[in-house]
Interface confidence: low
């Protein structure tokens, strides 16, 4: 019987998560007379096979980040080797898994700030990057402060956007930091995929050394 | 929690047909295909075939595949095994187990003991 | 088929011990896991994909290999680690089980 798994040669679009160790056949192509086998060209990166009975299926796990379109063509041919119908483009595609680690560029920043500079205002980027599908939750980053020291009174005086790793100063940091009481900080910085929101997400760490430097600008007296 | 409940043990004549159940309960049936194994007393794990998640399709060991039928009814969240033509080689210990792509076969059934004996 | 050779097949270790098996495959293969059953039971899965421990599992425990070369590494044996120890493939068609390395306790 023709169904999801079987059925007569034509353009064919199959969608398989990467990582996948082989688990079913892609697809039973069936032969109409004269034709007798089928063959295989294209992208095949030696994974994709097709036997002679027109069973298209693959051998080893795909990977997204190698390709994440395989382009292959199938033939149908007769006893005599020669081409009856097709080829047709049968189009493979890799769906992604969060099988990436975020990554940030350097292990160590390093950065300095104005005391009173408003609050939100960014003066320093951290940056990751993850080889999985950003258009997915697999490569959707999420920054934030892990830790600060030192921590005065339990009050954080930097901040960072959750998605774009800007570092800032909050209210209270802009209001009290003070270099001549405490000249340096240093914050640690996760990134997390999955937007931050598994269990399972990857996680990576980096250490920001921020330098408060004396805000020379004072207000004139009346 | 996760619990697949196979069939209790047969004793079955040479040349007789069994059917075991496996059923699932604790996480939605249709988002995991379901493996089956065999083990001969003593012996290492062989590897049956599968049934796929949703629609039916299965694929064997060439090795079993006049002796394995798998069936599935989704609605009552339950995966069969028939095993034909028994012979006394059949004698063994058959586990169903839950196979989700990444990860391997993470949960097992208790294991159906068949013996096949005049 | 892609055959699976556990060695050894029978082993013991006293407790505090470092263990190791190896499992080799006749081809390449992507992933290794690995089972635990212990007498009686039905086989519980240990290590997948390689190297991730299953939920559960003594961090004690590690996995490493590729290609046709895969091991299971107990760093210090202990009395609940005995049972038997299978590998497993499912990266080629029939997806095979080696023989079993039935570790004891001294």
């Known amino acids: 019987q023709e169904g999801k798994f079987s059925g007569p040669l034509k353009p064919m679009t199959f969608s398989i998560y990467e990582g996948q160790e082989p688990s079913q056949i892609i697809f039973q192509f069936k032969a109409n007379p004269p034709a007798v086998t089928f063959e295989l060209t294209g992208e095949t990166d030696n994974i994709f096979v097709i036997e002679r009975e027109g069973l298209l299926y693959y051998n080893r796990a795909l990977d997204r980040e190698t390709r994440s379109t395989h382009n292959l063509q199938v033939a149908a041919l007769d006893a005599n080797g020669i081409i009856v119908e097709g080829p047709v483009p049968i189009t493979i595609k890799v769906k992604d898994i969060n099988d990436n680690r975020p990554t940030f560029l350097q292990s160590k920043y390093e950065g300095s700030v104005r005391q009173n500079s408003r609050p939100g205002k960014p003066f320093l980027y951290v940056n990751a990057t993850d080889l999985d599908d950003p258009a997915t939750p697999n490569g959707q980053l999420y920054y934030q402060i892990v830790i600060q020291l030192p921590m005065i009174n339990n009050v954080m005086y930097f901040q960072i956007n959750n998605k774009t790793g800007a570092i800032s100063l909050t209210r209270e940091g802009s209001q009290e930091l003070n270099p001549a009481k405490n000249p340096s900080y240093n914050l640690v910085i996760s990134v997390k995929d999955m937007g931050g929101q598994s269990e399972n997400s990857f996680s990576d760490t980096t250490s920001v050394d921020i330098i408060v430097t004396e805000n020379i600008w004072k207000a004139p007296k009346p | 929690e996760v619990q697949l409940q196979q069939s209790g043990p047969e004793l079955v004549k040479p040349g007789a047909s069994v059917k075991i159940s496996c059923k699932a309960s604790?996480?939605?049936?249709?988002?995991?295909?379901m493996h089956w194994v065999k083990q001969s007393h003593g012996k290492s794990l062989e590897w049956i075939g599968y049934?796929?998640?949703?629609?039916?399709?299965?694929g064997y060991n060439q090795k079993f595949k006049n002796k394995a039928t798998l069936t599935v009814d989704s609605s009552s969240s339950t995966a069969y095994m028939e095993l034909r033509s028994l012979t006394s080689e059949d004698s063994a210990v058959y586990y169903c187990?839950?196979?989700?792509?990444?990860?391997?076969?993470?949960?097992w059934g208790q294991g159906t003991s068949v013996t096949v004996s005049s | 088929q892609i055959v699976l050779t556990q060695s050894p097949a029978i082993m013991s270790a006293s407790p505090g011990e470092k263990v190791t098996m190896t499992c080799s495959a006749s081809?390449?293969?992507?992933?290794m896991h690995w089972y635990q059953q212990k007498p009686g039971t039905s086989p519980k899965r240990w290590i997948y994909?390689?190297?991730k421990l299953a939920s559960g599992v003594p961090a004690r425990f590690s996995g490493s290999g590729s290609g046709t070369s895969y091991s299971l590494t107990i760093s210090s044996m202990e009395a609940e680690d005995a049972g038997t120890y299978y590998c497993?493939?499912?990266?080629?068609?029939?997806?095979?089980f080696g023989g079993g390395t039935k570790l004891e306790i001294k």
């Open positions: 187990a839950r196979n989700y792509w990444r990860g391997a076969m993470d949960y």
């Open positions: 604790g996480y939605t049936f249709t988002d995991y295909n």
């Open positions: 049934i796929y998640r949703n629609n039916g399709y299965n």
């Open positions: 081809s390449s293969i992507s992933y």
């Open positions: 994909d390689t190297s």
């Open positions: 497993h493939q499912r990266s080629s068609y029939p997806w095979t």
